[in-house]
Interface confidence: low
C-alpha cells in the first residue's frame, strides 16, 4: 500500500480476519466449520491436553521454519504420542548394568496405528524429561541398527538445571525407516559422550521413567512423563485427498522465474475465534496472535537520482533490489489447535499461522 | 501487479537492473563505481582466485539463509583466509603419536590482521581437505580450551569417497572468542568419535597437509590445500560508517507489527555487468542470474464467496492468509565478487543477490 493513501486499518484487519477464516478451514480440508451438535461438554481429557501442551511446547522452543513448505506440509498435521515400551518388559533385562547408557524401546505396531503409511509422517520427536541435575554432561543419542550395533543420531550439551526439563530430538528419519520395516521392537540409546582419553564415561543425567526412582520422587501421573515419541502426520483421509487434487508446485528455478524484496513493520492482531470468527468449535486455544504486515516499500532507485543520497536508503527500503517491493512476513510460526470431530477430540498443528516479523520484499 | 493489467516485462526488467546497480554499490558502500585508472592488467593473482573459488564453493554447497539479516550482514563481507601454522612448528611435537586425533594450530595475530575487531567478524569456517578414503568414519571437532582440555564443537559422519573433498565447519564463535583474547597460538583437534564400547578409536580419515604424505602424492601447490580458516568480515572503514550512519532496525516483533503471504513464479534475468550496467570494474564474475518475482496474488477470500470453491485456492494463492498478498522472493542466495580498490584486488560476498524461488506473501 502506498504511503500517500490513508490506510483504513480496520478494513485491513477485517480482510486479514476473513482470510484467516478460509486459511484455517482450508488447512483442515473442511468446506465448513464442523457441527457442534455432539461435542461433549466439560474440560478436555487429560491425555488430549497433554498432547496439545507437548505440541505447544514444541512451537515455543523452536524458531520459525522459513523453508519453502512442500504441498503436504501446508495442511494440518494430526499429533499423537507413543509411549516407550514399559520398563518391566524383558527387552530391558540385558541393558540394566550398563553405566554409560539408558535405553528406550518402542513397539512399531503402536507407531503404525498412528501413522499407517511412512510418507504420511511429517515429523517425529523423541521427548525425554530430564530430572534436575547439578552436573554438566555431553550426551549422545543412538538408534538401534542391527542386533548389536547402534547408529549415532545426535548430541547435546546438558548444563545443570534446578528443575526437570524436556529434551527433544528430531527422529523423523528413524521413525520413517521403522515404518518401512516390519513390525517389532525398535529402540534408542541415550549415552554419555565417551571421550578418547577419559576413563569416567558414566551417564550422570537421569531421565524420568527410566532412571531409578529417587527417594521422595512422586510416581509419574498416568505415565505422562516417561519418554515418548511425539508424531505429526497427515491423516490418511486427507492424504488421499492430497494425491487426487491438483498439486501445488514448488516455486523455484526448476519451474518458473520472477522477483521482489524490502523492509517494513509487523502489526499486532489478536484473533479471538469466538468473537472475530464466530467459531465455538476450536477448543484450544481461545485465540492467537495472528498479526499482519503493513507499511510502505518505495522503489527508491532511478537513473536521475543522485547516487549518494539514495544509497543509504537501500538497506532499509529495497535490500533485495526489487522492481516493485512490497511488505510481507519474514518469520512465521505454526499454531496447534484442539477441536472435535464428532465426539473425538483432535490435536492438529497448522503451519505458518503466526506472523513474527515482516520485510520489504 | 494485477492480472488485469498488461505487464511490460521489459520495463520490469529495466527497473530490476537499475535497482541492482544501486544494491551492489550500496552493499559495498560506494557512492559511485571505483575508478578503473590504476587497475593492473592481466589475470588475477592465484591467491585471489583461490579465495574467490573458496567463496563460490561455499555458496554452491549451502542453501540460502532465510534468517532476518542484522544491519551489518546487509553489507558486503571481505573474504580472507588464514593458513594453519606450518607443520614444522614445534607446537605439533607433542601431538605426533596420538592415533585418535590430528591437530591444527593457528596464530591469532594472523587472524587479527584480517579482522582487527571481534564484532567485524561475520563468519569463520575451518576448511579441511579430506583425501580419498574407502572407510566410513564418525569424526568430531574440538577447540583448544585450556592447557590440557578440549571443548567439543561438532561432529560429522564421513562416508567413503573416491576423490578428495573439502570439509567445512562453522567456527565463527570460536574465532570471535580468540580475537577477544590476547595474541598467541590457538588450535583445533579433529578426532575419531570414541565409542563407549569400541576399542578401535583410530582416526582413519586423512587430511591434506597434515596426514603423512602417501607415496605418489604431489606436494600441495603453494600450500593452498592445507587446512585454513575462511573468514568473512566487515572491513574496518565500512564498520566505522556503519556505527555513524542511522541504524536499520530489525523488523521483527521487537520493533514493529504488519502482514501478507502468497504463491507465484520466479522469472529468469541474467545481469551482464558490462552490457547491462556498463561496468568494467567487477572482475569476477562477468555477470550473474539475479532473477526476479512477478505474477498475480489475488486476495481470494470474501464473506460472500462459496467456501468449497475457494478453499482449494488457498494453498496456492494465499497460504499466509494475507490481507493483500503479493509476489516476493522466497529463497535468496549470496554472490561473491572480485574487484579492485586501487591496485589491490578484493574478494567480497554480497548477501541476498540471487532470487531462487518466489511466493505469494
Amino acid at each position: 500500500l502506498s504511503t500517500s493513501k490513508t490506510i483504513d486499518m480496520e478494513l485491513v484487519k477485517r480482510k486479514r480476519i476473513e482470510a484467516i477464516r478460509g486459511q484455517i478451514l482450508s488447512k483442515l480440508r473442511l468446506a465448513s466449520p464442523p457441527s457442534q451438535g455432539e461435542v461433549p461438554p466439560g474440560p478436555l481429557p487429560e491425555a488430549v491436553l497433554a498432547l496439545y501442551n507437548s505440541t505447544r511446547d514444541r512451537v515455543a522452543g523452536e524458531s520459525a521454519d522459513p523453508e519453502p513448505e512442500p504441498e503436504a506440509d501446508y495442511y494440518a498435521k494430526e499429533v499423537t504420542r507413543v509411549l516407550m515400551v514399559d520398563r518391566n518388559n524383558a527387552i530391558y533385562e540385558k541393558t540394566k548394568d550398563i553405566s554409560h547408557s539408558i535405553y528406550m524401546f518402542f513397539n512399531t505396531s503402536d507407531i503404525r496405528e498412528a501413522v499407517p503409511e511412512p510418507p504420511l509422517l511429517s515429523r517425529a520427536e523423541l521427548r525425554l524429561q530430564r530430572l534436575k541435575s547439578s552436573v554438566e554432561q555431553h550426551v549422545e543419542l543412538y538408534q538401534k541398527y542391527s542386533n548389536n550395533s547402534w547408529r549415532y543420531l545426535g548430541n547435546r550439551l546438558l548444563t545443570p538445571t534446578d528443575t526437570p526439563e524436556w529434551l527433544s530430538f528430531d527422529v523423523t528419519g528413524v521413525v520413517r525407516q521403522w515404518l518401512n520395516q516390519g513390525d517389532g521392537i525398535q529402540g534408542f540409546r541415550f549415552s554419555a559422550h565417551c571421550s578418547c582419553d577419559s576413563k569416567d564415561n558414566k551417564l550422570h543425567v537421569e531421565i524420568n521413567g527410566i532412571s531409578p526412582k529417587r527417594r521422595g520422587d512422586l510416581g509419574t501421573i498416568h505415565d505422562m512423563n516417561r519418554p515418548f515419541l511425539l508424531l505429526m502426520a497427515t491423516p490418511l483421509e486427507r492424504a488421499q485427498h492430497l494425491h487426487s487434487s491438483r498439486h501445488r508446485r514448488a516455486l523455484d528455478t526448476n519451474y518458473c522465474f520472477s522477483s521482489t524484496e524490502k523492509n517494513c513493520c509487523v502489526r499486532q492482531l489478536y484473533i479471538d475465534f469466538r468473537k472475530d470468527l464466530g467459531w465455538k468449535w476450536i477448543h484450544e486455544p481461545k485465540g492467537y496472535h495472528a498479526n499482519f504486515c503493513l507499511g510502505p516499500c518505495p522503489y527508491i532507485w532511478s537513473l536521475d537520482t543522485q547516487y549518494s543520497k539514495v544509497l543509504a536508503l537501500y538497506n532499509q527500503h529495497n535490500p533485495g533490489a526489487s522492481a516493485s517491493p512490497c511488505c510481507v512476513p519474514q518469520a512465521l510460526e505454526p499454531l496447534p489447535i484442539v477441536y472435535y470431530v464428532g465426539r473425538k477430540p483432535k490435536v492438529e498443528q497448522l503451519s505458518n499461522m503466526i506472523v513474527r516479523s515482516c520485510k520489504c520484499s | 501487479l494485477s492480472t488485469s493489467k498488461t505487464i511490460d516485462m521489459e520495463l520490469v526488467k529495466r527497473k530490476r537492473i537499475e535497482a541492482i546497480r544501486g544494491q551492489i554499490l550500496s552493499k559495498l558502500r560506494l557512492a559511485s563505481p571505483p575508478s578503473q585508472g590504476e587497475v593492473p592488467p592481466g589475470p588475477l593473482p592465484e591467491a585471489v582466485l583461490a579465495l574467490y573459488n573458496s567463496t563460490r564453493d561455499r555458496v554452491a554447497g549451502e542453501s540460502a539463509d532465510p534468517e532476518p539479516e542484522p544491519e551489518a550482514d546487509y553489507y558486503a563481507k571481505e573474504v580472507t583466509r588464514v593458513l594453519m601454522v606450518d607443520r614444522n612448528n614445534a607446537i605439533y611435537e607433542k601431538t605426533k603419536d596420538i592415533s585418535h586425533s590430528i591437530y591444527m594450530f593457528f596464530n591469532t595475530s594472523d587472524i587479527r590482521e584480517a579482522v582487527p575487531e571481534p564484532p567485524l567478524l561475520s563468519r569463520a569456517e575451518l576448511r579441511l581437505q579430506r583425501l580419498k578414503s574407502s572407510v566410513e568414519q564418525h569424526v568430531e571437532l574440538y577447540q583448544k580450551y585450556s592447557n590440557n582440555s578440549w571443548r567439543y564443537l561438532g561432529n560429522r559422519l564421513l562416508t567413503p569417497t573416491d576423490t578428495p573433498e573439502w570439509l567445512s565447519f562453522d567456527v565463527t564463535g570460536v574465532v570471535r572468542q580468540w580475537l577477544n583474547q590476547g595474541d598467541g597460538i590457538q588450535g583445533f583437534r579433529f578426532s575419531a568419535h570414541c565409542s563407549c564400547d569400541s576399542k578401535d578409536n583410530k582416526l582413519h580419515v586423512e587430511i591434506n597437509g597434515i596426514s603423512p604424505k602417501r607415496r605418489g602424492d604431489l606436494g600441495t601447490i603453494h600450500d593452498m590445500n592445507r587446512p585454513f580458516l575462511l573468514l568473512m568480515a566487515t572491513p574496518l572503514e565500512r564498520a566505522q560508517h556503519l556505527h555513524s550512519s542511522r541504524h536499520r532496525r530489525a523488523l521483527d516483533t521487537n520493533y514493529c507489527f504488519s502482514s501478507t503471504e502468497k504463491n507465484c513464479c520466479v522469472r529468469q534475468l541474467y545481469i551482464d555487468f558490462r552490457k547491462d550496467l556498463g561496468w568494467k570494474w567487477i572482475h569476477e564474475p562477468k555477470g550473474y542470474h539475479a532473477n526476479f518475482c512477478l505474477g498475480p496474488c489475488p486476495y481470494i477470500w470474501s464473506l460472500d464467496t462459496q467456501y468449497s470453491k475457494v478453499l482449494a485456492l488457498y494453498n496456492q494463492h494465499n497460504p499466509g492468509a494475507s490481507a493483500s498478498p503479493c509476489c516476493v522472493p522466497q529463497a535468496l542466495e549470496p554472490l561473491p565478487i572480485v574487484y579492485y580498490v586501487g591496485r589491490k584486488p578484493k574478494v567480497e560476498q554480497l548477501s541476498n543477490m540471487i532470487v531462487r524461488s518466489c511466493k505469494c506473501s
Epitope: E10, C265, Q268, K275 | D252, T253, N254
Partner: antibody
Framework: EVQLLESGGGLVQPGGSLRLSCAAS????????MSWVRQAPGKGLEWVSA????????YYADSVKGRFTISRDNSKNTLYLQMNSLRAEDTAVYYC??????????????WGRGTLVTVSS | DIQMTQSPSSLSASVGDRVTITCRAS??????LNWYQQKPGKAPKLLIY???SLQSGVPSRFSGSGSGTDFTLTISSLQPEDFATYYC?????????FGGGTKLEIK
C-alpha cells in the same frame, strides 16, 4: 497540552457502584486504545481493563471480569470505567493510561494523575 | 496468566553507580516488555518499550535488553532523580501483567 484527567473516585460501601471518567486532551483520542491501571495503597501496579480506539474490542483482568465495564465516547474524548459489586480489595488509586500500539506493542505512554477509590463499610 | 517476577525487590545504591534490575516472565514473551518508573505520589512514567527501545525524552543512561523470558533494565550512572520504584510489564497477552516492582533507594 497532551494530558489525561481522571475523576469520579471516592468512598463507597462493599457491593456498591462507582463510575470513573477520564478526560483526554491534546491528541486524537479515537486513534488510541486506552486502559485503566490501579494501585492498592503501598502495593504494585495492576492492569484492570483496556479498550480499542474504536471501542469495538474490550479486555479485562480476571479479578474484575463481570463486575467492571470499560467504555469510551470518542465524540467527548472521554474514557469510562463502570464499577459494580465493589469489594474491599478494589480499594486503590485508579490511573487512566493511553496505549501506544503503533509499533505493534502495547505500552502505556501517557498516564493521568489517578483517582482514589475506597471501598469500606 | 503470565507472571512477571522482578529482582531485587529493593536496592540501595549511590549516585554514579551502575544499576541493573532484572525481570523474568513465567513463559516466553518475545520482546513484549516495557519498563516504568514511579516516584511516590506520582503516576508511573514509561522508560523503555519493546524490551530495548528508549521512549523519547528519557535520558540515554537508561537501557533495556533481553528477549524470551529474561530482561534487564540498566541505569549506567545513577542520578539523584533516578531514586524511585521501577516496574516491568508484559504486553504479550491479556491479562497484561506487571512485575512486583524494585525500589531503588539512596545508600
Amino acid at each position: 497540552e497532551v494530558q489525561l484527567l481522571e475523576s469520579g473516585g471516592g468512598l463507597v460501601q462493599p457491593g456498591g457502584s462507582l463510575r470513573l471518567s477520564c478526560a483526554a486532551s491534546g491528541f486524537t483520542f479515537s486513534s488510541y486504545a486506552m486502559s485503566w491501571v490501579r494501585q492498592a495503597p503501598g502495593k504494585g501496579l495492576e492492569w484492570v481493563s483496556a479498550i480499542s480506539g474504536s471501542g469495538g474490542s474490550t479486555y479485562y483482568a480476571d479479578s474484575v471480569k463481570g463486575r467492571f465495564t470499560i467504555s469510551r465516547d470518542n465524540s467527548k474524548n472521554t474514557l469510562y470505567l463502570q464499577m459494580n459489586s465493589l469489594r474491599a480489595e478494589d480499594t486503590a488509586v485508579y490511573y487512566c493510561a493511553r496505549v501506544d500500539s503503533s509499533g505493534g506493542y502495547w505500552y502505556f505512554d501517557l498516564w493521568g494523575r489517578g483517582t482514589l477509590v475506597t471501598v469500606s463499610s | 496468566d503470565i507472571q512477571m517476577t522482578q529482582s531485587p525487590s529493593s536496592l540501595s545504591a549511590s549516585v554514579g553507580d551502575r544499576v541493573t534490575i532484572t525481570c523474568r516472565a513465567s513463559q516466553s514473551i518475545s520482546s513484549y516488555l516495557n519498563w516504568y518508573q514511579q516516584k511516590p505520589g506520582k503516576a508511573p512514567k514509561l522508560l523503555i518499550y519493546a524490551a530495548s527501545s528508549l521512549q523519547s525524552g528519557v535520558p540515554s543512561r537508561f537501557s533495556g535488553s533481553g528477549s524470551g523470558t529474561d530482561f534487564t533494565l540498566t541505569i549506567s550512572s545513577l542520578q539523584p532523580e533516578d531514586f524511585a520504584t521501577y516496574y516491568c510489564q508484559q504486553s504479550y497477552s491479556t491479562p497484561l501483567t506487571f512485575g512486583g516492582g524494585t525500589k531503588l533507594e539512596i545508600k
